[in-house]
């Protein structure tokens, strides 16, 4: 009787757009056919997927966040067929360019400023806020009550993923008016993958590590 197959992986935590993953259907069995399923469907042809060793080895040449699976392999001969338990890949990715909400750039004096930052990332990113280049706090949400014109400036949300080793950021230039003008729409906010703001963050390293302000 055929044994129940199982999948071994050379990398269970691959990084998106960087790592290749090799899934091997074990054990080696004579006179058998090896089959693969992804998301409960038979393997479809893709330039990023490679089968080798008589279909026993499945290689994902460059993983993406959509390649989590589950993956199953099967073995069959003329008498019987067996299928493995599913295996899911924990693909680490991001952080993507963050989004700050709400999108308003103009605020009235005396209003509360309540900004939330979100970036798609696995694992969940580490969020920090900088105002005019100075670290404010290590949180996803930034709240400042009763803002004045002193709160004008560049509000940067910086996100970091220690698993991928990647950073990302976005800057919003916020203005506070003393008049009765309505809040402005989002306009344009600058974003970058670390590069645009790296000088600011490098310059703030001592403050980042040792001078946490509230």
């Amino acid at each position: 009787e055929l044994p129940k197959p199982y999948i071994s992986s050379n990398n269970s935590n691959p990084i998106e757009d960087k790592d290749a993953v090799t899934l091997t259907c074990e054990p080696v069995a004579e006179n058998t056919t090896y089959l693969w399923w992804v998301n409960n469907q038979s393997l479809s042809v893709s330039p990023r997927l490679q089968l080798s060793n008589g279909n026993r080895i499945l290689t994902l040449l460059s993983v993406t966040r959509n390649d989590t699976g589950p993956y199953e392999c099967g073995i069959q001969n003329s008498e019987s067929a067996k299928r493995s338990d599913p295996v899911t890949l924990n693909v680490t990715y991001g952080p993507d360019t963050p989004i700050i909400s709400p999108p308003d750039l103009s605020y009235r004096s005396g209003a509360n400023l309540n900004l939330s930052c979100h970036s798609d990332s696995n694992p969940s990113p580490q969020y920090s806020w900088l105002i005019n280049g100075t670290l404010r706090q290590h949180t996803q949400v930034l709240f400042i009550s009763k803002i004045t014109s002193n709160n004008n400036g560049a509000y940067a949300c910086f996100v970091s993923n220690l698993a991928t080793g990647r950073n990302n950021s976005i800057v919003k230039n916020i203005s506070v008016s003393s008049g009765d003008s309505a809040p402005g729409s989002s306009g344009l906010s600058a974003s970058g993958s670390g590069s645009g703001l790296n000088d600011i963050f490098e310059a703030q390293k001592i403050e980042w590590h040792h001078h946490h302000h509230h």
Epitope: N13, P123, S124, P125, Q126, Y127, S128, Q137, H138, T139, Q140, V141, L142, F143, I144, L162, A163, H214
Partner: antibody, heavy 120, light 107 residues
């Protein structure tokens, strides 16, 4: 100065209920994700529950799931832990803690703790 | 769940000495790792996060290192206020877990 002050602990019988509170001051409470962490009589630290800054996401340790409920009132700068169906193994010092970074961050600030004793 | 194995369980040292505490994670946690200090009758205090970043106000005689599964905390030139219990913890998502602690005592 950052301050987290827990209250509501005490002696309760097995099967009983208790509600813990944590009053925050000295920082923007509504911006911070919060957790409850407990320390057993053997001095082991155990994470209990997590709530995001605006309460939209909550997570629990398997040992308390279905029995404990974490909540917060940002207008009152207060975090809560409602505990029911208490067991003797829930006896511990309960701390509230504020996170850096959220679910991928450490416990940056801790309260002084409130003692919960579950005993017949 | 990720298990954190801390060693030694206790350690005796004298003022001025250098000591190292280690912690092992049961799986790769990258640098999502923290150290805490707890003194008798007090709550834990954050010392190090992201494996090597010193928390605000922590003296430079403390240093954290490691990534992946192996981590260590080194205390150079021990001071009287450094004695207490040290805990490691991963912050690589939920559930967070702690090591069992290392009690650092005065020799």
């Amino acid at each position: 100065e950052v301050q987290l002050v827990e209250s509501g602990g005490g002696l309760v019988k097995p099967g009983g209920s208790l509600k813990l509170s944590c009053a925050a001051s000295g920082f923007t409470f509504s911006s911070y994700d919060m957790s409850w962490v407990r320390q057993t009589p053997e001095k082991r630290l155990e994470w209990v529950a997590f709530i995001s800054s605006y309460g939209g996401r909550t997570y629990y340790a398997d040992t308390v799931k279905g029995r404990f409920t974490i909540s917060r009132d940002n207008a009152k700068n207060t975090l809560y832990l409602q505990m029911s169906s208490l067991k003797s193994e829930d006896t511990a010092m309960f701390y509230c803690a504020a996170h850096y970074f959220g679910t991928s961050g450490p416990f940056a600030y801790w309260g002084q703790g409130t003692l919960v004793t579950v005993s017949a | 769940d990720i298990q954190m194995t801390q060693s030694p369980a206790s350690l005796s040292a004298s003022v001025g000495e250098t000591v190292t505490i280690t912690c092992r994670a049961s799986e790769n946690i990258y640098s999502y790792f923290a150290w805490y200090q707890q003194k008798q009758g007090k709550s834990p205090q954050l010392l190090v996060y992201n494996a090597k970043i010193l928390a605000e106000g922590v003296p430079s005689r403390f240093s954290g290192s490691g990534s992946g599964t192996q981590f260590s905390l080194k205390i150079n030139s021990l001071q009287p206020e450094d004695f207490g219990t040290y805990y490691c913890q991963h912050h690589y998502g939920i559930p967070f877990t702690f090591g069992s602690g290392t009690k650092l005592e005065l020799k």
